[in-house]
């Protein structure tokens, strides 16, 4: 029985140019995490993987960073970056749980960041 | 569509060298991790090696660990084993295997395989 | 040494159901995961031709295997079934596991499944 929930930053926003932080956290379940995947529709951004660590896809690599922890971080934000991310958890034994963030990108200085998230 | 074409395969003396190569096509090569499996004549599946999306982590079975070496190039879609210092015992037909996206689940795609033949 | 034992034939009648077991065993008590044999993998090979996937994380079918085959798990075995057996079935059937700690894949011996 799946029992866990995943908690994540909900919905940011931020400025062109920018960087953002895209956190989730699984709770309420004693499932071992085997792997992480980071997806942006459904395209691949990265894998952080409890054996092999992390990878950022190809097309990604020069604006993706691993971390903090199993967040992945954006750098140089464009507008074509707004839209929905997902962090996809592989799980034994309970499967896959999948949360989602939508990210906004604005043209102006005055976007307004969600509320800051930490891993407890 | 995906496809993995093995090569390199042949007729060689105990002691030499072969190395064999798997293009891959019809998928992001990059995000994969491979797997390089064999079957002797008559016999089971046996695992040969395993390599990371970047090259940078690699496994061997005890069977051929010192002898054989997994690599990949990413710009050429190109997977690779080069085999020194062969045995008869080597003797069988050598697959290169695409691994599900968490490569913990299994293999998904494998190539049609190249013949090793180890004889004096 | 990491072990997969599946029984080396297996037989059945068109129409029938058939069940092929996968057993675990390991040597290496200092293996980092608890259950080591927890993602098991199942590949069909017919006569003469590479192995194809059949199931996945030890249950999941890929798209386009019939659902005539299914995958399950209980404690240091896993299970094939195939349901509604099929001329076209007989072939070598491998389970596979990655073992964490030996950072290794194993596979079983293979069972020959005939169909009478």
């Known amino acids: 029985m799946m029992t866990g929930t995943i908690e994540t930053t909900g919905n940011i926003s931020a400025e062109k140019g920018g960087s953002i932080i895209l956190q989730c956290h699984l709770s309420s379940t004693t499932a071992q995490v085997t792997q992480v995947n980071w997806e942006q529709q459904d395209q691949l951004l990265a894998i952080c993987n409890a054996d092999l660590g992390w990878h950022i896809s190809p097309s990604f690599k020069d604006r993706v960073a691993p971390g903090p922890g199993l967040g992945l971080t954006l750098q140089s934000l464009t507008v074509n970056d707004t839209g929905e991310y997902f962090c996809i958890y592989h799980t034994y034994p309970d499967g896959t749980y999948t949360g989602r963030i939508f990210l906004e990108v604005l043209e102006s200085s005055v976007a307004e960041h969600g509320a800051r998230f930490q891993i407890p | 569509e995906v496809q993995l074409l093995e090569s390199g395969g042949g007729l060689v003396q105990p002691g030499g060298s072969l190395r064999l190569s798997c293009a891959a096509s019809g998928f992001t090569f990059d995000d994969y991790v491979m797997s390089w499996v064999r079957q002797a004549p008559g016999k089971g599946l046996e695992w040969v090696s395993l390599?990371?999306?970047?090259?940078?982590?690699?496994y061997y079975a005890d069977s051929v660990k010192g002898r054989f070496t997994i690599s990949r190039d990413n710009s050429k879609n190109t997977l690779y084993l080069q085999m020194n210092s062969l045995r008869a015992e080597d003797t069988a037909v050598y697959y290169c295997a695409k691994h599900w996206i968490v490569y913990q689940y299994g293999m998904d795609v494998w190539g049609q395989g190249t013949t090793v033949t180890v004889s004096s | 040494q990491s072990v997969l034992t599946q029984p080396s034939s297996a037989s059945g009648t068109p129409g029938q159901r058939v069940t092929i077991s996968c057993s675990g065993t390991i040597s290496n008590i200092e293996t980092k995961y608890v259950s080591w044999y927890k993602y098991v993998s199942w590949y069909q090979q017919l006569p003469g031709t590479a192995?194809?996937?059949?199931?996945?994380?030890?249950?999941q079918r890929p798209s386009g295997v019939p659902d005539r085959f299914s995958g399950s798990q209980s404690g240091t075995s896993a299970s094939l079934a195939i349901s509604g057996l099929q001329s076209e079935d007989e072939a070598h059937y491998y389970c596979a596991s990655w073992e964490g700690g030996l950072n290794s894949w194993v596979f079983g011996g293979g069972t020959k499944l005939t169909v009478l």
């Open positions: 390599i990371n999306w970047s090259g940078g982590t690699t």
């Open positions: 192995p194809k996937l059949l199931i996945y994380n030890n249950v």
